[in-house]
Interface confidence: low
């Protein structure tokens, strides 16, 4: 349905609050260093040229399209060249080109300053002060430092942001009661900006099918009793949506989103049973509940997939007939068989099946080729359940700071080359898998872990991207979607790697580290750990132990003492010594 | 790029052994996955075992699971295959093949690099 004015088409359509909100999240995650005065007087800009063009559609320039006018709009910041250097080249160029050049721009690592909180009271006043400023503030500094996060979706969080200090800001003790609200959003944040890079990197890296073929696994296990049909459906709009969102098309996105839910609700009974609480919800609660629900039972007595997947006559003919929509069929159907399996899993089987269609469709006798296909399928189900057995043991042996170090060690012998920051990062997450998903029963662990270590590996690949530093890492960035945490499970130690020279100032500590937050704490060891095995790549578990036992007390020693620095600077001496002679270094 | 010659393969009885070695050259031995396909003749190439880099996973086609045994040595930039209680449906012509990194380790197409084969002949 083309409109006359799109600007005026998405103002009317979302209503100017969330306009305003989703032009300012657009803004700043382009343009990511920008102040963001800056950025209110642009989007106050856009704001008023849209309700010119709501009044009057003929009005000129509202036939535009948003990225012609939004382009328009960033290319006129006056420091675009020294704020950000070649990405000021965008401008000479026309849409699409221009938008595209812009996205090819965004910064997964931006170099900001880290965000750190004010005292409870101090936030409180500023909310009370300026409600409107506070919550577009919250807006552009989570947008700015995650430029991929699915916008209507900060939209909620802001909401709920809000929520929490207008509740705590009049309780009795503010900060306990405001504190682990916002801990809560801050996690669920990261986690959920940790998603959706993944879903753009799946559009944007491996294409639209890639991405049509997880959503079809994802709803298939989630609404196990809605036909194929209506899985197809919610799959192209879905699809749509992510693709706005990737693209910077945010109020495209927002607004397609709101369909969505509102198509989902309208037709929950041919959906799933679960869907009833969601859809008495406001519409960013019912679209973030939506997007979360649980899975819905099984139907009873599903059929054996073998009859038209492997024992029917009519296979080849079928596969021939329509690839893509045969195979959708297939990873439909296994999948919502299969609550218990990963996504990825079901997407590594759908290609098994896909490659062995391929070439048995081609043989004398596509059959008998073809038979057996689903035996192909054992080792790849075996191999993540053991994975992930064995890591729940460690996990359940070790506890989660210590599964970290674990992770540290095993993917610092892995990929050296990495910077330090991302693999204590990377690691430290990867880590979390234990106390996410070891707790669930074995039908929810495979699909917890595996689907989140896809989350965690693409921060890596993305993290990579922007500074390539290790063939191993691209191969098993870019070879297969689905197979990178095989890849990364199957790295061994790199022996090609040249052992980083010793040097004492990286382990040179003082007395501010006993400041710090148990997490800084940790962060600041797992730091010094991985630097070790930088040094020392073939150290054994024993030998690293042995020197992170005695750092650790080393640190608790040196936090009691009356002179804290002198402490540092003499034990920390007589540790390096030691730490080299126990390493050999 | 890694070149890779079997040997020893040959006629056995029902219930011998056998032992196959891979000699491999030109790379960097230690950072290679390898393999062990087979191919019967008329019959599509199948895949036998396979061994991470540093040998610390084995895998095993369900047929050859608990008889043959894949192993490898990085001094000598060789695999090996020990066949035990070996069949008449093992005969075939078996061929050694290199990986940097395979997204499992049973699919033929993800092998970079292939010896040029070792006949077996299991017959009474």
């Known amino acids: 349905d083309a409109h006359k004015s799109e600007v005026a088409h998405r103002f009317k359509d979302l209503g100017e609050e969330n306009f305003k909100a989703l032009v300012l999240i657009a803004f700043a995650q382009y343009l990511q260093q920008c102040p963001f005065e800056d950025h209110v007087k642009l989007v106050n800009e856009v704001t008023e040229f849209a309700k010119t063009c709501v009044a009057d559609e003929s009005a000129e320039n509202c036939d535009k399209s948003l990225h012609t006018l939004f382009g328009d709009k960033l290319c006129t910041v006056a420091t675009l060249r020294e704020t950000y250097g070649e990405m000021a080249d965008c401008c000479a160029k026309q849409e699409p080109e221009r938008n595209e050049c812009f996205l090819q721009h965004k910064d997964d690592n931006p170099n900001l300053p880290r965000l750190v909180r004010p005292e409870v009271d101090v936030m409180c006043t500023a909310f009370h002060d300026n409600e409107e400023t506070f919550l577009k503030k919250y807006l552009y500094e989570i947008a700015r430092r995650h430029p991929y996060f699915y916008a209507p979706e900060l939209l909620f969080f802001a909401k709920r942001y809000k929520a929490a200090f207008t509740e705590c800001c009049q309780a009795a003790d503010k900060a306990a009661c405001l504190l682990p609200k916002l801990d809560e959003l801050r996690d669920e944040g990261k986690a959920s900006s940790a998603k959706q890079r993944l879903k753009c990197a799946s559009l944007q890296k491996f294409g639209e099918r890639a991405f049509k073929a997880w959503a079809v696994a994802r709803l298939s296990q989630r609404f196990p009793k809605a036909e194929f049909a209506e899985v197809s459906k919610l799959v192209t709009d879905l699809t749509k949506v992510h693709t706005e969102c990737c693209h910077g098309d945010l109020l495209e996105c927002a607004d397609d989103r709101a369909d969505l839910a509102k198509y989902i609700c309208e037709n929950q009974d041919s959906i799933s049973s679960k869907l009833k609480e969601c859809c008495e919800k406001p519409l960013l609660e019912k679209s973030h509940c939506i997007a979360e629900v649980e899975n819905d039972e099984m139907p009873a007595d599903l059929p054996s997939l073998a009859a038209d997947f492997v024992e029917s006559k009519d296979v080849c003919k079928n596969y021939a007939e329509a690839k893509d929509v045969f195979l959708g069929m297939f990873l439909y159907e296994y999948a919502r068989r299969h609550p218990d399996y990963s996504v990825v899993l079901l997407l590594r089987l759908a290609k098994t099946y896909e490659t062995t269609l391929e070439k048995c469709c081609a043989a004398a006798d596509p059959h008998e080729c073809y038979a057996k296909v689903f035996d192909e399928f054992k080792p790849l189900v075996e191999e993540p359940q053991n994975l992930i057995k064995q890591n729940c043991e460690l996990f359940e042996q070790l506890g989660e700071y210590k599964f970290q170090n674990a992770l540290l060690v095993r993917y610092t012998k892995k990929v050296p080359q990495v910077s330090t920051p991302t693999l204590v990062e990377v690691s430290r997450n990867l880590g979390k898998v234990g106390s996410k998903c070891c707790k669930h029963p074995e039908a929810k662990r495979m699909p917890c872990a595996e689907d989140y270590l896809s989350v965690v590996l693409n921060q890596l690949c993305v993290l990579h991207e922007k500074t390539p530093v290790s063939d191993r890492v691209t191969k098993c960035c870019t070879e297969s979607l689905v197979n990178r945490r095989p890849c990364f499970s199957a790295l061994e130690v790199d022996e090609t790697y040249v052992p980083k020279e010793f040097n004492a100032e990286t382990f040179t500590f003082h007395a501010d580290i006993c400041t710090l937050s148990e997490k800084e704490r940790q962060i600041k060891k797992q730091t010094a750990l991985v630097e070790l095995v930088k040094h020392k790549p073939k150290a054994t578990k024993e030998q690293l132990k042995a020197v992170m036992d005695d750092f650790a007390a080393f640190v608790e020693k040196c936090c009691k003492a009356d002179d804290k620095e002198t402490c540092f600077a003499e034990e920390g001496k007589k540790l390096v010594a030691a730490s080299q002679a126990a390493l050999g270094l | 790029d890694v070149q890779l010659v079997e040997s020893g393969g040959g006629v056995v009885q029902p219930g011998g052994s056998l032992r196959l070695s891979c000699a491999a050259s030109g790379g960097t031995f230690s950072t290679y996955v390898m393999g062990w396909f087979r191919q019967a003749p008329g019959k599509e190439r199948e895949f036998v075992a396979a061994?991470?880099?540093?040998?610390?996973?084995?895998y095993y086609a369900d047929s050859v699971k608990g008889r043959f045994t894949i192993s490898r040595d990085n001094s000598k930039n060789t695999v090996y295959l020990q066949m035990n209680s070996l069949r008449p449906e093992d005969t075939a012509l078996y061929y050694c093949?290199?990986?940097?990194?395979?997204?499992?380790?049973?699919?033929?197409?993800?092998?970079?690099?292939w010896g040029q084969g070792t006949l077996v002949t299991v017959s009474s």
């Open positions: 061994i991470s880099q540093n040998s610390i996973h084995t």
């Open positions: 093949a290199a990986s940097r990194f395979t997204s499992w380790y049973t699919a033929d197409y993800e092998y970079d690099y």
